[in-house]
């Protein structure tokens, strides 16, 4: 089931999924002056079986001016720099994310891809928040959000993160790591059945990846 909305916005913070649950869709969009190849895929889709998950389909862009050129190669460094996303670009990909069953890792860039990646998340997806450069984190609890299904509707849990503009070179000082305790996450609908597939395993993954995510300065 797709999440009805996008993860919550936190002032001066960006979010990142460290792994994408099966069923996640990524728009195949091209940058200005380029278009999807005729009969090209509209979306990349994270699919898999019990042992392996991967992105189905390749996004392919071609020049709007030319009809038959199709390109799908790794972009040059300057093309990669041009792409931004609503999520944070992690300087290093944690190795743990590949080992999480039923999840795909970040798809590689394709040539002439749009400047923003748009994902369509599914129930059970977890995203992690980090303050943007120039802001530091004050944690009241986990700096993450999970898409949950409650009473047939989806919602994202509220990340317990405040980004303050104090002049600090390091955004995520070691002593201010997110707490793993669930008390920091307010739940108003405790009486309802909540279906969060893989929530526990993702929480465990979050704990193991905490260091690599939250101690690396945002580039």
């Amino acid at each position: 089931e797709l999440c009805d909305d996008d993860p919550p916005e936190i002032p001066h913070a960006t979010f990142k999924a460290m792994a994408y649950k099966e069923g996640t869709m990524l728009n195949c969009e091209c940058k200005r002056g380029f278009r999807r190849i005729k009969s090209g895929s509209l979306y990349m889709l994270c699919t898999g079986n019990s042992s392996h998950s991967s992105w189905d389909n390749q996004c392919q862009c071609t020049s709007s001016a030319t009809r038959n050129t199709t390109k799908q190669v790794t972009p040059q460094p300057e093309e990669q720099k041009e792409r931004k996303t609503t999520e944070m670009q992690s300087p290093m990909q944690p190795v743990d994310q590949a080992s999480l069953p039923g999840h795909c890792r970040e798809p590689p860039p394709w040539e002439n891809e749009a400047t923003e990646r748009i994902y369509h998340f599914v129930v059970g997806q977890m995203v992690y928040y980090q303050c943007v450069q120039g802001y530091r984190a004050l944690h009241r609890g986990p700096a993450e959000s999970v898409c949950k299904m409650t009473h047939g509707k989806t919602r994202w849990t509220q990340p317990q993160l405040i980004c303050t503009g104090e002049m600090e070179t390091s955004q995520f000082p070691g002593e201010e790591k997110p707490q793993a305790s669930p008390e920091g996450r307010p739940e108003s609908e405790t009486s309802c059945l909540v279906t969060t597939t893989d929530f526990q395993i993702q929480t465990e993954m979050a704990a193991t990846m905490e260091t690599s995510i939250f101690t690396t300065e945002y580039q």
Partner: nanobody, 117 residues
Framework: EVQLVESGGGLVQPGGSLRLSCAAS??????MGWYRQAPGKQRELVAS???????GYADSVKGRFTISRDNAKKTVYLQMNSVRPEDTGVYYC?????????????WGQGTQVTVSS
């Protein structure tokens, strides 16, 4: 490939009927919607259907249009009855997320519907 191929459009007289089809190959079982874009206007949601078959409609088409799906065939339909000139536009099918605007989806070609006498 995740493909959404719309068909069934055409020229129809006011009060007439059309049935649009959307072949959703490679698409997971998710909520889907029919959208339309009238000339010079923004793309808008016409009807939606959940993976379980729950439906919703724009006020302008309630009682006239019916959305349905055949999960085995991976096809979504839009039955258009009692059509009006204001139903004219390009009709698209796509995923449906209630809180996410259509500008954030990836779009196919659509099928043209023209209501005129």
């Amino acid at each position: 490939e995740v493909q959404l191929v719309e068909s069934g459009g055409g020229l129809v007289q006011p009060g007439g009927s059309l049935r649009l089809s959307c072949a959703a190959s490679g698409m997971p079982l998710v909520a889907m919607g029919w959208y339309r874009q009238a000339p010079g206007k923004q793309r808008e949601l016409v009807a939606s259907i959940s993976s379980g078959g729950n439906t919703g409609y724009a006020d302008s088409v309630k009682g006239r249009f019916t959305i349905s799906r055949d999960n085995a065939k991976k096809t979504v339909y839009l039955q258009m009855n009692s059509v009006r000139p204001e139903d004219t536009g390009v009709y698209y099918c796509n995923i449906y997320r209630s809180q996410v605007p259509p500008t954030r989806y990836s779009w196919g070609q659509g099928t043209q519907v023209t209501v005129s006498s």
